[in-house]
Amino acid sequence: AITEAREEAKPYPLFPGPFPGSLQTDHTPLLSLPHASGYQPALMFSPTQPGRPHTGNVAIPQVTSVESKPLPPLAFKHTVGHIILSEHKGVKFNCSISVPNIYQDTTISWWKDGKELLGAHHAITQFYPDDEVTAIIASFSITSVQRSDNGSYICKMKINNEEIVSDPIYIEVQGLPHFTKQPESMNVTRNTAFNLTCQAVGPPEPVNIFWVQNSSRVNEQPEKSPSVLTVPGLTEMAVFSCEAHNDKGLTVSKGVQINIKAIPSPPTEVSIRNSTAHSILISWVPGFDGYSPFRNCSIQVKEADPLSNGSVMIFNTSALPHLYQIKQLQALANYSIGVSCMNEIGWSAVSPWILASTTEGAPSVAPLNVTVFLNESSDNVDIRWMKPPTKQQDGELVGYRISHVWQSAGISKELLEEVGQNGSRARISVQVHNATCTVRIAAVTRGGVGPFSDPVKIFIPAHGWVDYAPSSTPAPGNADPVLII
C-alpha cells in the first residue's frame, strides 16, 4: 500500500532497530555532506503515475567477510511513497540505506523523473558509521514547492558497478487551478458565431469551468475542463473570461475583448508629396481599421477648376504603403483628391478632400501649319504658324523656339531663335544663298520646350532669282516634307 504523508503529518520513523528513530533526534552524524554541483536542475513532471511505486534495484555483494559469511543484499529502505501538499509549502523526504563498511566512496544521487538533480537543491547526505555497516540517510528538501516540483523522486547509489535504486517518492503539489489555455482576444463579424476555449488543470482534479461575459456568468452549471464556449453572435464589443474551480479554490483567467468588425474610419492627413505637370504623388494616414485588416484603397480625383466638368477618376491601389502617384492628369489644373480604404466589411467614408494642382509642363504638341517663304526684296525668310491647341500647351505659352538649318555644298549650320508668344510669325535673315533652309518650330512654356514641328525646307537661290511661293508643313499623309519652290 502507498503511504501518504499529508503536509500536517509527523515524520515517519525511518530506522527501526539500532538506527535513530527520526531525523529530529539529537544524534549528531559524524559527517554531513551537501550535494555539491554548479548546475541548476531541470525539474520535470513525472510520467510515472502516483500510487504505483516500483521496487528499487537490489545489489547482492560478492565480497565475503573473513568468516566468509555472505553479505545481505543492499537495498534502500522503504519510505513514504506519496506526499501531497499545497503550493508554496515546504517538504522534506529521505532515502536510507545501510552499507557494509568494506565499501568505500559511496555517494547517493537524487533523480527526478529520470533526470539527475544537480546543483542548487537542498540535498544533504548524512553518514552514521557502526562496527560493520554505515547507515546513510539522504534527505531532500524544498522550502516552497511549486507545480514544477511535481514528480517522481528516487535515490541512486553506485556500488561495484551496480546501481541501487530506491522506490519512488511521488510529490504531488496541489493548488489553485492553473490555466493551460485561456480565451484569446478576437475580432468577429457581427451576429456570427465563434468559439472560446478555456482549459485549466490541478491537482487537485477535477477542475470545473464557469464562463463570464461582461461580469455576468454565462453558464449556470459548470463544465469540466477543458471547456469550449460557443457564442451565437454579438452585436457589440464584449469582455469574456473564465473561472476555473477545484477543491483548493478558484482562478480567474485574463479578460479578453471580443471586438465587432466594422467598416474602417476614413483616412486622415492626405497630403501632397510632389506635383509634376501630369502627376501628383499623395500620401495619407490610414484611419482605424475597424478590427479587420485593410485590403485596398481607392483614390478619388475630381476636376476642381471652376470651369471644369468635374470629371471623376478613381484609382485603386494596395493599402500599403499609404502612398500613390496619380497619373494622366492635365497640366496646370486643380484637382480635389480624397482617399477611401476598405476591409472585409466594406469601404470607409472618403477622407477630407484636399486641393492639389499640377504644374506647368512643356507643350505636348508642336505648332501647326508651319509655312516658310522667301522675301527676296528684304533678303529674309518669313515663317508663319498656328499655336498649338490650348489644352496641349500644358502651360502658359511664353514663346517659340525656331530652329533653322542652312545646308550648302557640304556645309551645315544650325541657328536657334527665340520669339515671344504674341503673334504667330517670325522673320529670319538669309544666312547662305544657293542653299537649303530647314525650319522647325517648338512652343515654349515655363515648363519647358515642346516637340519641334516637322521640318519644312525651302531653297534659297543665288541672287537675282524672282518670285518665290511659300513652302509649308505638308498635309497629313504626304510622305515627303521637302518642298523646293
Epitope: Q300, K302, D305, P306, L307, S308, N309, G310, S311, V312, L332, S336, G338, V350, W353, P389, T390, K391, E396
Partner: antibody
C-alpha cells in the same frame, strides 16, 4: 443624349420656401458638377453655386449662402436647390447647368407673390 | 471675387458687319473665359469655351481671343440669327462671375 429636366414654374408665398428640381439623364450623374444660375426678368446671369453628385460637395457664391441649399439624390439622378425665406427679390428663372455649362435645363420660373 | 466688366451694353450692327464684344476681368484668369449666346425665353448656349475653343456646331464666324484679363468675342459677317444677348463667364476662380451682357441687334 444629355438632358436636364426642370419644372416650368413654381408659385410661392413670401416667407415660404421652394425646392427646385433638376433631373439628369443621358450621362453618368455622379461624374460631373451641376451648377445653378439665377436670372431675374430682363437681367443678367448670376452664379449661385455648384454641387458634385459624387460626394455631394457643394461650393456656394457667398451672396447665396443661407438662401440656397444644394443637394442631390443619386438614386433618382436629381439635383435640388432649396430656396428659403423667399421675397420678391427671389422671383427669377433658375437654371441648372451641367459641367462647364455646355448643357442647360430649360429653367424654372419661381414667382414670389402673396 | 473676380469682377467682369462687359462692354458695350448694346450693339447695333448692319448685316454682314463685324461685331466685337469685350470683357475685362479684375484678376488674371489665364485663358479661362467662356462666351454664351442667349435668345429670349431660352437658356444660354455655350459658343466658345476656355482657351478660345469654338464649340462643335457653332458657326466659324464666331471667334474669341484674349489671355489674362482682356478678352474679345468677334462675330464676323453678322446674320439676323445672331440677334441675341451675349454673356462672358470667367472661370479663373470661384465664385464664377458673368459679364453684365451685351444686346446685339440688327440695324
Amino acid at each position: 443624349q444629355v438632358q436636364l429636366q426642370q419644372p416650368g414654374a413654381e408659385l410661392v408665398k413670401p416667407g415660404a420656401s421652394v425646392k427646385v428640381s433638376c433631373k439628369a439623364s443621358g450621362y453618368t450623374f455622379t461624374n460631373y458638377w451641376i451648377h445653378w444660375v439665377k436670372q431675374r426678368p430682363g437681367q443678367g446671369l448670376e452664379w449661385i453655386g455648384r454641387i458634385h453628385p459624387f460626394d455631394s460637395e457643394p461650393n456656394y457664391n457667398q451672396k447665396f449662402k443661407g438662401k440656397a441649399t444644394l443637394t442631390v439624390d443619386k438614386s433618382s439622378s436629381t439635383a435640388y436647390m432649396h430656396l428659403t425665406s423667399l421675397t420678391s427679390e427671389d422671383s427669377a428663372v433658375y437654371y441648372c447647368a451641367l459641367a462647364s455649362f455646355a448643357y442647360w435645363g430649360q429653367g424654372t420660373l419661381v414667382t414670389v407673390s402673396a | 471675387e473676380t469682377t467682369v466688366t462687359q462692354s458695350p451694353a448694346s450693339l447695333s450692327m448692319a448685316m454682314g458687319e463685324k461685331a466685337t464684344i469685350r470683357c475685362i476681368t479684375s484678376t488674371d484668369i489665364d485663358d479661362k473665359m467662356n462666351w454664351y449666346q442667349q435668345k429670349p425665353g431660352k437658356p444660354p448656349k455655350l459658343l466658345i469655351s476656355a482657351g478660345n475653343t469654338l464649340r462643335p456646331g457653332v458657326p466659324s464666324r464666331f471667334s474669341s481671343s484674349g489671355y489674362g484679363t482682356d478678352f474679345v468675342l468677334t462675330v464676323e459677317n453678322m446674320l439676323s440669327e445672331d440677334v441675341a444677348d451675349y454673356y462672358c463667364l470667367q472661370g479663373g476662380a470661384l465664385p464664377l462671375t458673368f459679364g453684365s451682357g451685351t444686346k446685339l441687334e440688327i440695324k
